[in-house]
């Protein structure tokens, strides 16, 4: 009876996500067979989040809307470890929007999920950010510095990275 009600709950939770994520990849969390964490297929997972690399070229606002439709946001990078995981799936000759912008052009950077912007946990390329008109952030590869962030114009189409919390069932 307990297992039956747990299964019903899981099925109703899965139905919530079915519209945008018809397939989920789930793994057992810990030793308890009743706890599973899932990411949409073919998203990748790291710690408590799921990541999707969008290869379509879109403006920053459209990229954020695209992530939002999938129940996600443009990626918020909180640690060096998280960035190291993300870059494993990126192409060196491409640039990807992050969920970081400065719409007022006053160097008040803000993350899309309202995570406080912490200057101590940023990975800007040297000399960046460098232009008040460039109000959106990308991550890209520079041979001299490897992967880092750069400010660019928000209306210029780029690839992007979406991030969402894992689905627990």
């Amino acid at each position: 009876n307990f297992m039956y009600s747990k299964t019903v709950k899981r099925l109703s939770k899965l139905r919530e996500y079915q519209q945008y994520h018809p397939s989920l990849t789930c793994v057992m969390e810990g030793k308890d067979i009743e706890d599973w964490s899932c990411c949409p297929t073919p998203w990748t997972s790291f710690q408590s989040s799921c990541y999707f690399i969008s290869t379509g070229m879109q403006s920053w606002t459209k990229s954020q809307k695209n992530c939002s439709v999938m129940g996600a946001d443009l990626v918020v990078i909180n640690t060096r470890e998280e960035q190291d995981f993300i870059i494993q799936n990126l192409k060196r000759n491409s640039s990807y929007f992050l969920g970081l912008s400065d719409p007022g052009g006053r160097r008040h950077w803000q993350w899309v999920d309202q995570t406080p912007y912490n200057e101590n946990v940023t990975f800007w390329h040297s000399g960046e950010p460098n232009n008040l008109d460039e109000r959106c952030a990308i991550i890209n590869f520079r041979s001299s510095e490897e992967w880092g962030w750069n400010d660019i114009h928000c209306h210029v189409p780029q690839k992007s990275i979406c991030k969402m919390k894992k689905i627990y069932i």
């Epitope: 879109q58 403006s59 719409p103 007022g104 232009n131 008040l132 008109d133 109000r135 114009h153 928000c154």
Partner: antibody, heavy 121, light 111 residues
Framework: EVQLVESGGGLVKPGGSLRLSCAAS????????MSWVRQAPGKGLEWVST????????YYPDSVKGRFTISRDNAKNSLYLQMNSLRAEDTAVYYC??????????????WGQGTTVTVSS | DIVLTQSPASLAVSPGQRATITCRAS??????????MHWYQQKPGQPPKLLIY???NLESGVPARFSGSGSETDFTLTINPVEANDAANYYC?????????FGGGTKVEIK
């Protein structure tokens, strides 16, 4: 007072080339993105190219890509448009316009008087 | 590309009356309360002149007879009351993404 003055227009044969210039004054030219916008006779406005303030970014519509090149010389407060392989449909008044950024986009807050380009045999 | 459709293509208005021009975008040009639609006036033989930026902000030096409104895909430029020297072509423009695009224009004639 902000001023944008275009020059370099004229009559050219199909396949020919022209270089338009825009002399800027009254503002810190190097701090602004700039664009060229054209208007064919009796028609509406069509954006032709954009260059960022730092020269790091240029952009063109498919209709002129590979034929037109936008550039700038911040030391001379000048914007340029090199037009090659000109076609009859490139006939228009060409305006140089200053971009002012607002939130995630921009608008054109100042325009020059325009220079006329006529492509005809 | 985002397509902007203006209507009407032309209209004739008597001085003192209201003129309303609409601009419809093929997709949203708004984001988090910011509407990246702008309006320009162009008189014969002159370059375009900025009237309204970000849907509803009046450019400095533009008379308060001009106003703008709208969000997402539908925007309106209103001139009230119309004066004789408002005879011109009016264009909308979006800048939320490249390429920047303009509407086809609306010609306002004064009766």
């Amino acid at each position: 007072e902000v001023q944008l003055v275009e020059s370099g227009g004229g009559l050219v044969k199909p396949g020919g080339s022209l270089r338009l210039s825009c002399a800027a004054s009254g503002f810190t030219f190097s701090s602004y993105g700039m664009s060229w916008v054209r208007q064919a006779p009796g028609k509406g406005l069509e954006w032709v190219s954009t260059i960022s303030s730092g020269d790091s970014y240029t952009y063109y519509p498919d209709s002129v890509k590979g034929r037109f090149t936008i550039s700038r010389d911040n030391a001379k407060n000048s914007l340029y448009l090199q037009m090659n392989s000109l076609r009859a449909e490139d006939t228009a008044v060409y305006y140089c316009a200053r971009q002012l950024y607002y939130s995630y986009g921009y608008y054109f807050d100042y325009w020059g008087q325009g220079t006329t380009v006529t492509v005809s045999s | 590309d985002i397509v902007l459709t203006q209507s009407p293509a032309s209209l004739a208005v008597s001085p003192g009356q209201r003129a309303t021009i609409t601009c419809r975008a093929s997709e949203s040009v708004s984001f988090h309360g910011t509407h990246l639609m702008h309006w320009y006036q162009q008189k014969p033989g002159q370059p375009p002149k900025l009237l309204i930026y970000a849907a509803s902000n009046l450019e400095s030096g533009v008379p308060a007879r001009f106003s703008g409104s709208g969000s997402e895909t539908d925007f309106t430029l209103t001139i009230n009351p119309v004066e004789a020297n408002d005879a011109a072509n009016y264009y909308c423009q979006q800048s939320i993404e490249d390429p920047p695009t303009f509407g086809g224009g609306t010609k306002v004639e004064i009766k």
